[in-house]
């Protein structure tokens, strides 16, 4: 059976296509190619007479067609108007004609696309942004890339207009991009330059650093305030409610106890119109803001009940601290047999009883800090009664 095949089937505009013919009958007078799905003299492209080996252009000939002795038809410099069906009719020597229809599709070489946006400076959690991939072309697939990755599944991302438009609902600061669109057809593909979003947001609740609360007299107080914000926030400081200065950093040299108080950082974004504040308490004191971990020691850790006594000692290098003791999560002393001495550094138990066995630890503290020792285990044993063999000395 007579058939035709397009090589290639998808053709780039400006390129060429060859309509190949298969199973061409042997005894022929000639053949004709037509534009369309049927034989129509008004749409004849070319005819070829085998006897004279002469090609005759038809009404639909554009000058870009070449017919070969094997009936194949070459069309050069194709345009999108060339897309469609082509019919070959062969005139056999028995005066019975045979026909075959083929087709091909011409696609344009795609240009470099560009992204247009309806809002390049959206406000976080408030505005939506619609990106449109330009230009609009027929038979084109539109793809989108965010951060060089294909679109994630998200209810905030919507595609429309044949995927040509990407809409971000309620943008966040993480939606800055970059965004790229890609256009594809069967013969070419092209990607846009990246586009980034300038998402306006904030300020978030400011953070004051460092996190220290306690300072010694004579130290320098240097506080810095930061609030995530776009555009960057404008900062001001208040001490105990009184405005001090409009800077991101606050510096007070050689502080005294009088500098203790509430330090407020105020952050403002003039574009969003939002304000946020954070309050930090500063305490200027001679006391150590950090109490070291105390060490606990026992005169012995295994004792005989109702017979032995034991001394537990809590050691610390810190000054101006207090000490308290704990046994089984309860504060001591808890009985007449327990005594505290030397400013609570020593816990004496005399005598030790079975109920005194267990875990002990001490805690050192001052008004601004505390720390506790590792626990120590006290074991209490009882000796067995003397063995009686039933014999009297004598």
């Amino acid at each position: 059976q007579l058939t035709t095949e397009s090589m290639p089937f998808n053709v780039a505009e400006g390129k060429e296509v060859l309509l190949l013919v298969h199973n061409l009958p042997q005894q022929l007078f000639g053949y004709s190619w037509y534009k369309g799905e049927r034989v129509d003299g008004n749409r004849q492209i070319v005819g070829y007479a085998i006897g004279t080996q002469q090609a005759t252009p038809g009404p639909a000939n554009s000058g870009r067609e070449t017919i070969y002795p094997n009936a194949s038809l070459l069309i050069q410099n194709v345009t999108q108007n060339d897309t469609g069906f082509y019919t070959l009719q062969v005139i056999k020597s028995d005066l019975v004609n045979e026909e075959a229809t083929g087709q091909f599709h011409v696609y344009p070489e795609l240009p470099k696309p560009s992204i247009s946006s309806n809002n390049s400076n959206p406000v976080e959690d408030k505005d939506a942004v619609a990106f449109t991939c330009e230009p609009e072309t027929q038979d084109t697939t539109y793809l989108w890339w965010i951060n060089n990755q294909s679109l994630p599944v998200s209810p905030r991302l919507q595609l429309s207009n044949g995927n040509r438009t990407l809409t971000l609902l309620s943008v966040t600061r993480n939606d800055t991009g970059p965004y790229e669109c890609e256009i594809q057809n069967p013969v070419s593909a092209n990607r846009s330059d990246p586009v980034t979003l300038n998402v306006t947001y904030g300020p978030d609740t400011p953070t004051i650093s460092p996190s220290d609360t306690y300072y010694r007299p004579g130290a320098n107080l240097s506080l810095s305030c930061y609030a995530a914000s776009n555009p960057p926030a404008q900062y001001s400081w208040l001490i105990n409610g009184t405005f001090q200065q409009s800077t991101q950093e606050l510096f007070i040299p050689n502080i005294t106890v009088n500098n203790s108080g509430s330090y407020t950082c105020h952050a403002n974004n003039s574009v969003t119109g939002c304000n946020r504040t954070t309050v930090k308490t500063i305490i200027v004191t001679e006391l150590s803001p950090v109490v070291a971990k105390p060490q606990i020691k026992a005169s012995k850790t295994t004792v005989t009940g109702d017979k032995d006594s034991v001394n537990l000692t809590c050691s610390t290098n810190d000054t101006g601290i207090s000490i308290r003791w704990f046994f089984k999560n309860q504060s001591l002393p808890s009985s007449e047999r327990m005594k505290l001495s030397q400013g609570n550094t020593t816990l004496s138990i005399n005598p030790v009883k079975r109920e005194d066995a267990g875990t002990y630890w001490c805690e050192v503290f001052n008004p601004i800090s505390k720390n506790q020792s590792d626990p120590i285990m006290l074991n209490v044993n009882y000796n067995a009664l003397p063995q009686e063999n039933g014999l009297s000395p004598g």
Epitope: N42, Q44, G51
Partner: antibody, heavy 121, light 111 residues
Framework: EVQLLESGGGLVQPGGSLRLSCAAS????????MSWVRQAPGKGLEWVSV????????YYADSVKGRLTISRDNSKNTLYLQMNSLRAEDTAVYYC??????????????WGQGTLVTVSS | QSVLTQPPSASGTPGQRVTISCSGS????????VSWYQQLPGTAPKLLIY???KRPSGVPDRFSGSKSGTSASLAISGLRSEDEADYYC???????????FGGGTKLTVLG
């Protein structure tokens, strides 16, 4: 069944005009090249003109160039011959004929019964 | 004067084989297909042979065509009385850009 039926012949004075028609049936008219062939009384066959199946290609015999015009209406399955400036030597039976080879191996497989054109004063 | 040359007449008795010749040039017979037509008295011509030697369906195999160089021949074997008619050869002429016929040969079946 293939049928070709000519009409429009008759008596006309020298210099006059006439339009012949050939109604085709029984085949796909638009797929075939068509010709007019004439035969003067007692004489042999003389080819007059051919028109391709789509009407894009037309040829004439030198003896009629500029005076006779061939045309076709594929929607009406009809072939025409417009005859102007007629002469006595144009007197003949005019046949329309079908070429099944689209002109690749010109031949006439079906002929009409003919219509007589007489040019006389 | 016809472009293709045929004998004006030919004759034969029933059952005989008769040959009619047609002579042309390289611009017609030499490079194009030849057809033969039969015209019975008072009727339109009928195609007998096309493409030099091919017979349309319905034409008896008593009729055959051949071609050599710039000449063609029609042979009729087993001649019958109903074969009495005018016979024309025809071919496309590349120089004239037109179809040309021979002057015709009148075949008479004797007896």
């Amino acid at each position: 069944e293939v049928q070709l039926l000519e009409s429009g012949g008759g008596l006309v004075q020298p210099g006059g005009s006439l339009r012949l028609s050939c109604a085709a049936s029984g085949f796909t008219f638009s797929n075939y090249a068509m010709s007019w062939v004439r035969q003067a009384p007692g004489k042999g066959l003389e080819w007059v003109s051919v028109i391709s199946h789509g009407g894009g290609s037309i040829y004439y015999a030198d003896s009629v160039k500029g005076r006779l015009t061939i045309s076709r209406d594929n929607s009406k399955n009809t072939l025409y011959l417009q005859m102007n400036s007629l002469r006595a030597e144009d007197t003949a039976v005019y046949y329309c004929a079908r070429d099944p080879t689209k002109g690749y191996a010109p031949t006439f497989d079906y002929w009409g019964q003919g219509t007589l054109v007489t040019v006389s004063s | 004067q016809s472009v293709l040359t045929q004998p004006p007449s030919a004759s034969g008795t029933p059952g005989q084989r008769v040959t009619i010749s047609c002579s042309g040039s390289s611009s017609n017979i030499g490079n194009n297909y030849v057809s033969w037509y039969q015209q019975l008295p008072g009727t339109a011509p009928k195609l007998l042979i096309y493409a030099d030697s091919k017979r349309p369906s319905g034409v008896p195999d008593r009729f055959s065509g051949s071609k050599s160089g710039t000449s063609a021949s029609l042979a009729i074997s087993g001649l019958r009385s109903e074969d009495e008619a005018d016979y024309y050869c025809g071919a496309w002429d590349q120089s004239l850009n037109g179809y040309v016929f021979g002057g015709g040969t009148k075949l008479t079946v004797l007896g």
